[in-house]
Amino acid sequence: VPRWRQQWSGPGTTKRFPETVLARCVKYTEIHPEMRHVDCQSVWDAFKGAFISKHPCNITEEDYQPLMKLGTQTVPCNKILLWSRIKDLAHQFTQVQRDMFTLEDTLLGYLADDLTWCGEFNTSKINYQSCPDWRKDCSNNPVSVFWKTVSRRFAEAACDVVHVMLNGSRSKIFDKNSTFGSVEVHNLQPEKVQTLEAWVIHGGREDSRDLCQDPTIKELESIISKRNIQFSCKNIYRPDKFLQCVKNPEDSSCTSEI
């Protein structure tokens, strides 16, 4: 008799999840020699241990502590780039500006980027059929708790000037419910962080509005100021030109506004 399986509203675990996590760990340590002390098999065991045999709506940050410990990594605290709803451009930027880091440029962020995973209570099986959706099912699911945990730690580590890339094409340029708005903003440490600088990325070719005056940006400024952190904002009118100028800063066209 087939065992009854909980049907969740979200997509199931990404196919080849164990193989992908292990392969990504090996790749990361090849690319980043400073992380070669990491034992990738132990990393996978700790990752698996965080959610296997546990109810996928009952995951805690504590479940991920063994993984967090194994993945401890020091990134330059003044070279952190946060992002919200504009991941691809943020990653294109750090690919060119090699001394800056998004969360996905760290081992733990790299391991989990774009993946979904969950288990089932009291069985060692990974659920490839469905996983809980944050809104429709529960917020304490394995994926959401993971990102909340690593995002909090990443924000806590930041210092000096912290940059955040925001999507100017969205109705809420700053969204209080995003990971940036709900976790990272509140975990920047005022005793270490001097300024949060927002880069608002324009989508339209002819969009010359000052999106730094957007009400949601003003809301972000208010939250940040109340936390005794300075706030600044820049419009990036031409993201393509912006990237090109990061690659070739001496280009004559890079002195004008981008």
Epitope: E19, A23, R24, V26, R36, Q95
Partner: antibody
């Protein structure tokens, strides 16, 4: 078993570009970093750079920056290395290579090599 | 970039002889040195990884040692099929760099 099969020999004129392919089998392309190494006639081995095929991230040796483009097509499990503005000193055998799970960070897996001749 | 200075550049030895090749790194590379064998017209073949670990299927006459900056590769008893060029490579930092190679011939 893991296999890396490269495209055939190429003869190019100075100033032209060449694109060498490396089709993998026995594993998924995105599961490993792909490295490129070249060897001039009667010369030693020279590492050119790597690509992480999953994200398209690359790291190219200083000597080749601006002339080398590494790409990957995950739908066909093929990695590519394009070298532009060819000169006679680019005449070499070009290899793709990758690490394994029980080989530290050495390269147990190599393509058979692609000979590129640059001649006017 | 880390320079890998390999010596000798060539050597001639008799079958059964012990052959030793050295590689010196310009800075500390821990134990991240690999040794390759390359025969004419063929791709290099990994023999030793992480300074002293024999790769799967490699005969026990091949061995490696060293850490930091000084590394040694040894063929305990040279066989006719060992005629090849041998390279060291540091895999500690990018860019990876190779030694200049040692061509081994039979007397």
């Amino acid at each position: 078993q893991v296999q890396l099969v490269q495209s055939g020999a190429e003869v190019k004129k100075p100033g032209a570009s060449v694109k060498v392919s490396c089709k993998v089998s026995g594993y998924t392309l995105t599961d490993s970093v792909m490295n490129w190494v070249r060897q001039g006639p009667g010369k030693g081995l020279e590492w050119m750079g790597w690509i992480d095929p999953e994200y398209g991230r690359t790291d190219v040796a200083q000597k080749f920056q601006g002339r080398v483009t590494m790409t990957a097509d995950t739908s066909t499990d093929t990695a590519y290395m394009e070298l532009s503005s060819l000169r006679s000193e680019d005449t070499a055998v070009y290899y793709c290579a990758r690490t394994g799970y029980n080989s530290g960070y050495g390269f147990p897996y190599w393509g058979q090599g692609t000979t590129v001749t640059v001649s006017s | 970039d880390i320079q890998m200075t390999q010596s000798p550049s060539s050597l001639s030895a008799s079958v059964g002889d012990r052959v030793t090749i050295t590689c010196k790194a310009s800075q500390n590379v821990d134990s991240d040195v690999d040794w390759y064998q390359q025969k004419p017209g063929k791709a290099p073949k990994l023999l030793i990884y992480k300074a002293s670990n024999r790769y799967t299927g490699v005969p026990s006459r091949f061995s490696g040692s060293g850490s930091g900056t000084d590394f040694t590769f040894t063929i305990s008893s040279l066989q006719p099929e060992d005629i090849a060029t041998y390279y060291c490579m540091q895999s500690n930092t990018h860019p990876r760099t190779f030694g200049g190679g040692t061509k081994v011939e039979i007397k």
